[in-house]
């Protein structure tokens, strides 16, 4: 039991596969931990060994590669299940070693069940489509390497529970599903079922992804500040609470970072001594356009505070904008007994 570089349990690669379907799982060592590939390792005389720990057990045990019909097999750096069973769930370890070198990593494999409408605990990838774009395609994911190019599988696409046929703007084209002039009603879960033969048996691969229709870049605009604006004046007496909302609309932009911030006399609130709090809320439209509101609050405003410049700033990948709030000190109403009486000549 000489020392082995143990990369531990790689929970980043939480692998989920469907019950009773083929699964091919590559040893993560070569993809994420080592600087060389399997072929190089194999040429150097290193051996790849697989073992596993069943769910709710502590005991590591070798994988049985002598099951009927070679249900579990290893090919190069890939562990194959043809097909999976529910009790294959557990932590799997691949270890690369020879007499002088050893490196290993474990990863969790979860075999999940699905119902007749493809609902399951499987975490679904999200594919974003732009609204109204001409033609956009999604591709049946993670099916490479399951069958040779000489095999022509049959692919059936479903939206939710329904087979896609004669949908007006969603067209199955083999491994691809085309969306013509996508609308929000195209949002949903899409499933491809790939059926292929192997050694006299028929296997099915089920892949589901979520389609989310989002705002199109052709309609995207720089941030729009709805508040503060020129129509609203924040008129306060010293001692009152000053509340100024900064409300900004951001068009959806893929991978854009939307930012809103206040400056007071040109400085960030953190950099000044007055007691300011800022609360932010975010809401999204159906096409993932974003509205951010940051409320600037000064509990007991002073006459000095009412002379300051309060500017709301916003930035996205489309540009940067700023708008100053109109803040002024309220002129106190005259007190009748003194000021008005004097005005009427009373002594």
């Amino acid at each position: 039991s000489e020392r082995c570089d143990d990369w531990g349990l790689d929970t980043m690669r939480q692998i989920q596969v469907f019950e009773d379907e083929p699964a091919r799982i590559k040893c993560p060592l070569f993809e994420h931990f080592l600087k060389f590939n399997y072929s190089t390792a194999h040429s150097a005389g290193l051996t790849l060994i697989w073992y596993w720990t069943r769910q709710d057990r502590d005991l590591e045990e070798p994988i049985n590669f002598r099951l009927p019909e070679n249900r579990i097999s290893k090919e190069k750096d890939v562990l194959w299940f043809r097909p999976t069973l529910l009790n294959d769930t557990g932590n799997y370890t691949c270890m690369l070693r020879n007499t002088t070198y050893c490196s290993k990593v474990a990863f969790p494999l979860e075999v999940v069940q699905k119902d007749s409408c493809f609902n399951s605990p499987m975490k679904l990838p999200v594919h974003k489509l732009y609204i109204e774009y001409g033609i956009q395609r999604i591709t049946c994911p993670n099916v490479d390497g399951y069958f040779p190019s000489s095999v022509k599988p049959t692919i059936t696409w479903y939206m939710g529970c329904y087979k896609i046929q004669n949908f007006n703007n969603v067209i199955p084209e083999g491994m691809n599903l085309s969306f013509l002039i996508a609308l929000i009603s195209n949002n949903g879960n899409y499933t491809c079922v790939v059926t292929y033969p192997e050694n006299g048996r028929t296997f099915h691969l089920t892949r589901t992804l979520t389609v989310k229709v989002v705002g199109s870049p052709k309609n995207a605009v720089p941030p729009v500040i709805h508040s503060p604006n020129d129509h609203v004046v924040y008129e306060k007496e010293p001692g009152e609470e000053l509340l100024i909302p900064c409300t900004v609309y951001f068009s959806f932009l893929m991978d854009s970072r939307n930012e809103v911030w206040w400056t007071i006399d040109g400085k960030k609130p953190d950099d000044i001594t007055i007691d300011v709090t800022i609360n932010e809320s975010i809401s999204h439209s159906r096409t993932e356009d974003e509205t951010r509101t940051q409320i600037l609050s000064i509990k007991k405003v002073t006459s000095e505070d009412l002379k300051r410049s309060y500017v709301c700033h916003a930035r996205s990948a489309k540009g940067e904008v700023a708008k100053a709030a109109k803040v002024k000190q309220k002129v106190p109403a005259p007190r009748y007994t003194v000021e008005l009486a004097c005005g009427f000549g009373a002594t």
Epitope: G134, I135, N168, I181, L183
Partner: antibody, heavy 118, light 107 residues
Framework: EVQLLESGGGLVQPGGSLRLSCAAS????????MGWVRQAPGKGLEWVSA????????LYADSVKGRFTISRDNSKNTLYLQMNSLRAEDTAVYYC???????????WGQGTLVTVSS | EIVMTQSPATLSVSPGERATLSCRAS??????LAWYQQKPGQAPRLLIY???TRATGIPARFSGSGSGTEFTLTISSLQSEDFAVYYC?????????FGQGTKVEIK
């Protein structure tokens, strides 16, 4: 001011062809989806076809699929409808209209009459 | 396809009165519903989109409500220029479909 002006209508025999045009002005044509809607004499409105702003995506009503082709030339600000294998039931006023997903057909042309008769 | 059904087919109203037009969708169209007005010999004109938002230049006497499958267009006080045919249209799913129209005529 947004303007859409259809042309190309007329009398055609069953089985014949016609090409309608719609000249657009007053807005950035290349950023809007466009469509054709028709209205048979004394009847209601029927959506015929739509095309995406870039011309790549095209959709058709089942009643015209395989016979009509929608297209656009963004450099000329013009929308087209090529109508082949025309039938008597295609007789209608054909309107072109622009659309956005949140406002539907917000501007319409004045229409052009297509009459299919022997 | 989604079938849009309008009622009544004809509505007889006196000028100054209120008119209420109904539109029903065969399945939910969310709030993706538009109302159009069409006068004889003219193209349709967009009145309402998003079920309740008035289009540019449309007078406040026109209002829309509803979501899902049931929608209403209300004209609060009919003017002489409002006598026309009104169509609802869903734009939630392709193909976009229209109702058969409601004719608002002078009583």
């Amino acid at each position: 001011e947004v303007q859409l002006l259809e042309s190309g209508g007329g009398l055609v025999q069953p089985g014949g062809s016609l090409r309608l045009s719609c000249a657009a002005s007053g807005f950035i044509f290349s950023t809007y989806g466009m469509g054709w809607v028709r209205q048979a004499p004394g009847k209601g409105l029927e959506w015929v076809s739509a095309i995406s702003y870039d011309g790549e995506g095209t959709l058709y009503a089942d009643s015209v699929k395989g016979r009509f082709t929608i297209s656009r030339d963004n450099s000329k600000n013009t929308l087209y409808l090529q109508m082949n294998s025309l039938r008597a039931e295609d007789t209608a006023v054909y309107y072109c209209a622009r659309f956005r997903y949140y406002t539907a057909f917000d501007y319409w042309g004045q229409g052009t009459l297509v009459t299919v008769s022997s | 396809e989604i079938v849009m059904t309008q009622s009544p087919a004809t509505l007889s109203v006196s000028p100054g009165e209120r008119a209420t037009l109904s539109c029903r969708a065969s399945q939910s169209v969310s709030s993706n519903l538009a109302w159009y007005q069409q006068k004889p010999g003219q193209a349709p004109r967009l009145l309402i989109y998003g079920a309740s938002t008035r289009a540019t230049g449309i007078p406040a006497r026109f209002s829309g409500s509803g979501s899902g499958t049931e929608f209403t267009l209300t004209i609060s006080s009919l003017q002489s220029e409002d006598f026309a045919v009104y169509y609802c249209q869903q734009y939630n799913n392709w193909p976009w479909t229209f109702g058969q129209g409601t004719k608002v005529e002078i009583k």
